[in-house]
């Protein structure tokens, strides 16, 4: 599996009308990535 992304949570960082996570870490926290065996919909990105 690919190395997890940095988790720079911006839950308390507010831009004009927006809250931004800076890094899309959903793949690293996906159901697919949680499966330790078998084929996963989110394979490691090259």
């Amino acid at each position: 599996l690919a190395d997890p992304l940095d988790h720079r949570d911006a839950g308390d960082l507010w831009f004009p009308g927006e809250s931004e996570s800076f890094e899309d870490a959903h793949v690293e926290h996906s159901i697919s990535r949680s499966l330790l065996e078998g084929e996963i919909p989110f394979p490691p990105t090259s």
Epitope: E18, D24, H26, H29, S32
Partner: antibody
């Protein structure tokens, strides 16, 4: 086999409350970020709520359309997420899906009508 | 909010022929790590959405390789190299970078 099974939908009057559940199985749940997405009949997809994992202090995020009325939560011991819906409006009528963005449940229908 | 705009909204297709759908975001979805937070879903009639492409160009497993995703920070394309009858449904692009997360309005693909 990964399963996401929503329940709790039904008919409710405007101003009423409803609690949706999404029971999951087939994968290690505790580190997974989960979401609720809804879809009004014949319309597109609308993201409404997101809950992160314990390691992220169970941070939650909401769409403006539901903020202050809906609450997303999770019980890691039951591998289940919830959506408590209060002060329901007719425009909340939709199919509600729980999802990890890769896998999706089959949806549960919420109808708000007098 | 980040507005996701898809075109066309309706796409009649011929089996065996190529097809493409465009999606434009109102701001860049490119992160500092070079990830583009653009996802494509297909919702077949009467079904839940299914993931096709994640992070702009990565094919979800189980998805036929006739599907591909490409684009830049704000302009994206989903291509089907050879449409099959089972590809009918509504295609959505989505961004999961900026709250609130947003979907495109959907492109309905149907056989001519």
């Amino acid at each position: 086999e990964v399963q996401l099974v929503e329940s709790g939908g039904g008919l409710v009057q405007p101003g009423g409350s409803l609690k949706l559940s999404c029971a999951t199985s087939g994968f290690p749940f505790s580190n997974v970020w989960m979401h609720w997405v809804r879809q009004a009949s014949g319309k597109g997809l609308e993201w409404i709520a997101h809950i992160k994992a314990k390691s992220d202090n169970y941070a939650t995020y909401y769409a403006e359309s539901v903020k202050g009325r809906f609450t997303i939560s999770r019980d890691d011991s039951k591998t289940t997420i919830y959506l408590q819906m209060n002060s329901l409006k007719t425009e909340d009528t939709a199919v509600y899906y729980c999802t990890g963005l890769d896998y999706w449940g089959q949806g549960t229908t919420v109808t708000v009508s007098s | 909010d980040v507005v996701m705009t898809q075109s066309p909204l309706s796409l009649p297709v011929t089996p065996g022929e190529p097809a493409s759908i465009s999606c434009r975001s109102s701001r860049s979805l490119l992160t500092s790590k070079g990830i583009t937070s653009l996802y494509w879903y297909l919702q077949k009639p009467g079904q839940s959405p299914q993931l096709l492409i994640y992070r702009m160009s990565n094919l979800a497993s189980g998805v036929p390789d006739r599907f591909s995703g490409s684009g830049s920070g704000t302009d994206f394309t989903l291509k089907i190299s050879r449409v099959e009858a089972e590809d009918v449904g509504v295609y959505y692009c989505a961004q999961f970078l900026v709250y609130p997360y947003t979907f495109g309005q959907g492109t309905k693909v149907e056989i001519k």
